[in-house]
């Protein structure tokens, strides 16, 4: 049996501040159930960026349609990017439960972000 | 054209034991959650089960009781249904799940159901 | 565990009148309701999922709409083929997924 496969294709992405930056990643499969997060860095230290039901992220926006069926593209948009988003984004699958258990990450993109044109 | 046929119904008495399956064809089966749902005879529809990939989830009152778990190399779901009572006589639908967006899981495609009677 | 009231339990309508179901959730959903058809001796049918979304080949006539812990189905115009218990769904918090006690639409 193939196993879940979480897909960031892009090792780094780099965009202008001010822009936006799409972040893109995929799943190999719509099960086991649970959702996808979206964090920055890595360990216990790391920021959530976007997960669909709790929080409010209003720079966040995930690209593919909300109402689409059987969505496996969770890649997300982020809008009026600064300096200080820079970092490495990582897509993360949770199995469901109580409390979800993460089950895998991508392997990240680095978002490197320059100046401005003048 | 996605189809799902149950089988294993029947008639069993208390305490006794019975397997259904569900064969499903026309889509994807193996990357899709699926699930039962059963309905007491003259009554409204509640859930039973739902099968993952090896994650698994029950309804309070069959869990200890019931077991999922699904065949992909045969596009089979199988539940398992030990110390059965009088009160999971129903008929019983097996269901594939959808996802919409981000979000949770609901039920697009349903078998014809099969019917257990549990009774002495 | 969400608990989800429909009212009301039983409608008499006449064909081409406009038919108002109502779903409430003991807790928000967000928009995490689906609603189903079934007519005696069938299968569940999925009609709107995601409160207001129409699923392939559902006929326009049928609709969606609400968030949070209020949700509505509407028939437009009720066709004699649209008899049959609907009830909804909520997937927002589960285990376990939890339906309403349906409503029973009869023709008059």
């Known amino acids: 049996e193939e196993e879940l496969q979480v897909i960031q294709p892009e090792k780094s992405v780099s965009v202008a501040a001010g822009d936006s930056a799409t972040l893109n990643c995929t799943v190999s499969s719509l099960i086991p159930v649970g959702p996808i997060q979206w964090f920055r860095g890595a360990g216990p230290g790391r920021e959530l960026i976007y997960n669909l039901k709790e929080g409010h992220f209003p720079r966040v926006t995930p690209v593919s349609d909300p109402t689409k069926r059987n969505n496996m593209d969770f890649s997300i948009r982020i809008s009026n990017i600064t300096p200080a988003d820079a970092g490495t984004y990582y897509c993360v699958k949770f199995r469901k439960g109580s409390p979800d258990v993460e089950l895998k990450s991508g392997a990240g993109t680095e978002l490197s972000v320059r100046a401005k044109p003048s | 054209e996605v189809q799902l046929v149950e089988s294993g119904g029947g008639v069993v008495q208390p305490g006794g034991s019975l397997r259904l399956s569900c064969a499903a064809s026309?889509?994807?089966?193996?990357?899709?959650?699926v699930s039962w749902v059963r309905q007491a005879p003259g009554k409204g529809l509640e859930w039973v089960s739902t099968?993952?990939?090896?994650?698994?989830y029950y309804a309070d009152s069959v869990k200890g009781r019931f077991t999922i778990s699904r065949d992909n190399s045969k596009n089979t779901l199988y539940l398992q249904m030990n110390s059965l009572r009088a009160e999971d006589t129903a008929v019983y639908y097996c269901?594939?799940?959808?996802?919409?967006?981000?979000?949770?899981?609901?039920?697009?495609?349903w078998g014809q159901g099969t019917l257990v009677t549990v009774s002495s | 565990e969400i608990v989800l009231t429909q009212s009301p339990a039983t409608l008499s309508v006449s064909p081409g009148e406009r038919v108002t179901l109502s779903c409430r959730a003991s807790?928000?959903?967000?928009?995490?309701i689906a609603w189903y058809q079934q007519k005696p001796g069938q299968a569940p049918r999925l009609l709107i999922y995601?409160?207001?979304s129409r699923d392939t080949g559902i006929p326009a006539r049928f609709s969606g709409s609400g968030s949070g812990t209020d949700f509505t189905l509407t028939i437009s115009s009720l066709q004699s083929e649209d008899f049959g218990v609907y009830y909804c769904?909520?997937?927002?918090?589960?285990?376990?997924?939890?339906f309403g006690g349906g409503t029973k639409v009869e023709i008059k």
């Open positions: 026309g889509f994807s089966f193996s990357i899709y959650a």
């Open positions: 995601a409160a207001s």
């Open positions: 099968i993952g990939a090896d994650d698994t």
């Open positions: 807790q928000n959903v967000r928009s995490d």
């Open positions: 769904q909520q997937y927002y918090d589960w285990p376990p997924f939890t």
């Open positions: 269901a594939k799940d959808s996802t919409v967006g981000w979000s949770g899981d609901f039920f697009d495609y």
